[in-house]
Amino acid sequence: MNGRVDYLVTEEEINLTRGPSGLGFNIVGGTDQQYVSNDSGIYVSRIKENGAAALDGRLQEGDKILSVNGQDLKNLLHQDAVDLFRNAGYAVSLRVQHRLQVQNGPIGHRGEGDPSG
């Protein structure tokens, strides 16, 4: 029998400075593109090598982005969320939710689409 998988959820404010090639990450999610069941939130799906986010080091694949420059990302269409990031300016403040897996017992399998990464 597999051990129970629990999650530790933490929030963090991450301030990024837009680099020459931008912020350096990809997102999934939105009201028209639910990546996680029953959750239309915006999640980080890729951190680009040597991009601003990667060099900062705090944003991780699987993180949920709650707000950009204080603007809530709830109930946004996917492309509207993309556009919000693209128009966010040079200094970008992200409120993010990290969901860390805490393993109790045997190691389980974390599948694609699981927001923990």
Epitope: G22, L23, N26, I27, Y35, S45, R46, K48, Q79, V82
Partner: nanobody
Framework: QVQLVESGGGSVQAGGSLRLSCTAS????????MAWFRQAPGKEREFVAA??????YYADSVTGRFTISRDNAKNTVYLQMNSLKPEDTAVYYC?????????????????????WGQGTQVTVS
């Protein structure tokens, strides 16, 4: 890890048509940005077409002749190639990345994509 498998390549005479398919693993295919690139012998890999959540993109050399589309229920992206020319002869590669970049999207940049297929040969005589 995403696996990509291309099919549909072959030999055709100039003016003919082919439809390439690329099937991807993974249950969140609808979130993938997908692209086709090609590489002719002795030449660099060249962007052909891409399809993201926001729409389709094409290289100038194929605009009006090639059409990229996707069927999310089948985890498959297609490249319909019409009015083929000898210069379209190449190995055609499917590429994918999960999600949409929050930066300016340059579909022709191979670094935008994390996953690549093995390629399928297209020969136009």
């Amino acid at each position: 890890q995403v696996q990509l498998v291309e099919s549909g390549g072959g030999s055709v005479q100039a003016g003919g048509s082919l439809r390439l398919s690329c099937t991807a693993s993974g249950r969140t295919f609808s979130t993938y940005t997908m692209a086709w690139f090609r590489q002719a012998p002795g030449k660099e890999r060249e962007f052909v077409a891409a399809i993201s959540w926001s729409g389709a993109y094409y290289a100038d050399s194929v605009t009006g002749r090639f059409t990229i589309s996707r069927d999310n229920a089948k985890n498959t992206v297609y490249l319909q190639m019409n009015s083929l020319k000898p210069e379209d002869t190449a190995v055609y590669y499917c590429a994918a990345v999960i999600g949409s970049t929050v930066d300016s999207y340059w579909p022709g940049d191979p670094l935008e994509y994390d996953y690549w297929g093995q390629g399928t040969q297209v020969t136009v005589s």
